[in-house]
């Protein structure tokens, strides 16, 4: 029951996280104009990964896409790539995890298969969350660098010219959405990985009798059958044959057809 709850909660948390990553990627407020000490109040500018928007004092708002690829900073392209990779991995992870959910029955899918799928989706969610966090952090670092460069330019002047009045940009709402969403996706992925361990059926010992006919002496031994999940070392249901009184965890040998009476 706890495993099902952990898996279900991991799925829901990851779903919210990935929805947040998609929302952040599409948002226009990745950077917003810093209003402090800015003499220009007629316009307020905010920018996203895909377009720039201006809200004017008249209330009129206009947005324009960045129609050039070559003119954009490599860092912006890297952030775009990280966010898209995060979304794609998260979407695939969601798809896989739906089929892996313990509460959903699909054909005669074994628990071992569900456990594998849960682990796969969990890893995908973790990588997706890390991509989003990395993307947002790279963008934030770019803003901080740009902010201090602009501040320096304001007071020292650019290229020997007189003081430059340059618009500075600060963190927009999308950065916080991205960080939280990436964190949720990461947590959801960890929960899925934890759930995977509980989904893997434990090896169960069945009491049985096996015997090994070696010459004239016959030795009987209890606990001869071992059921396996496919996750342990004993990957096939093997009969354990023994000539002496050894424990079943010791070296095992495959039976031959002559061992059966």
């Amino acid at each position: 029951m706890a495993v099902t709850a952990c898996q279900g909660l991991g799925f829901v948390v990851s779903l919210i996280g990935i929805a947040g990553i998609i929302a952040a990627t599409c948002m226009d407020q990745w950077s917003t104009q810093d209003l402090y000490n800015n003499p220009v109040t007629a316009v307020f500018n905010y920018q996203g990964l895909w377009r720039s928007c201006v809200r004017e004092s008249s209330g009129f708002t206009e947005c324009r896409g960045y129609f050039t690829l070559l003119g954009l900073p490599a860092m912006l392209q890297a952030v775009r790539a990280l966010m898209i990779v995060g979304i794609v991995l998260g979407a695939i992870g969601l798809l896989v995890s739906i089929f892996a959910l313990k509460c959903i029955r699909i054909g005669s899918m074994e628990d071992s298969a569900k456990a594998n799928m849960t682990l796969t989706s969990g890893i995908m969610f973790i990588v997706s969350g890390l991509c989003a966090i990395a993307g947002v952090s790279v963008f934030a670092n770019m803003l901080v660098t740009n902010f201090w460069m602009s501040t320096a330019n304001m007071y020292t002047g650019m290229g020997g010219m007189v003081q430059t009045v340059q618009t500075r940009y600060t963190f927009g709402a999308a950065l916080f959405v991205g960080w939280v969403a990436g964190g949720l996706t990461l947590i959801g992925g960890v929960m899925m990985c934890i759930a995977c361990r509980g989904l893997a059926p434990e090896e169960t010992n069945y009491k049985a009798v096996s015997y090994h006919a070696s010459g004239h002496s016959v030795a009987y031994k209890p606990g001869g059958f071992k059921a396996s999940t496919g996750f342990g070392s004993n990957t096939k249901n093997k009969k354990i044959y023994d000539g002496g009184a050894r424990t079943e965890d010791e070296v095992q040998s495959y039976p031959s057809k002559h061992d059966y009476v």
Epitope: A42, V43, N45, S52, V54
Partner: nanobody, 118 residues
């Protein structure tokens, strides 16, 4: 790259008028403002007036009611009509285009001298 060419500066008597113009050539990102800033010797650069691509206008406190800014989007040109000039309006007037492409860009003209004196 954007080049700005200013014209119209000169010597004028107090109470007189002058018209500055600034033509921008090159590729300018669609969202922007064009405007005028001035810098008197020993002081910081201050806002005179700006006209945005969307039609909004803003004036600096010291020139409100005396100066008028206009903009021709088709020609990428901005004009500053200065009236009732005072000696304190003496400064180098700089044309500025600020584009709102990614993280913004500022382009500046070389400046034109305006001297208000008897």
């Amino acid at each position: 790259q954007v080049q700005l060419v200013e014209s119209g500066g000169g010597l004028v008597q107090p109470g007189g008028s002058l018209r500055l113009s600034c033509a921008a050539s090159g590729s300018i990102f669609g969202l922007n403002f064009m405007g005028w800033w001035r810098q008197a010797p020993g002081s910081q650069r201050e806002l005179v007036a700006i006209a945005t691509s969307g039609g909004s206008i803003q004036y600096g406190d010291s020139v409100k009611g005396r100066f008028t800014i206009s903009r021709d989007n088709a020609k990428n040109t901005v004009y500053l009509q200065m009236a009732s000039l005072k000696p304190e309006d003496t400064a180098v007037y700089y044309c500025n285009v600020h584009t709102y492409d990614f993280l913004g860009r500022d382009y500046w003209g070389q400046g034109t001298q305006v001297t208000v004196s008897l």
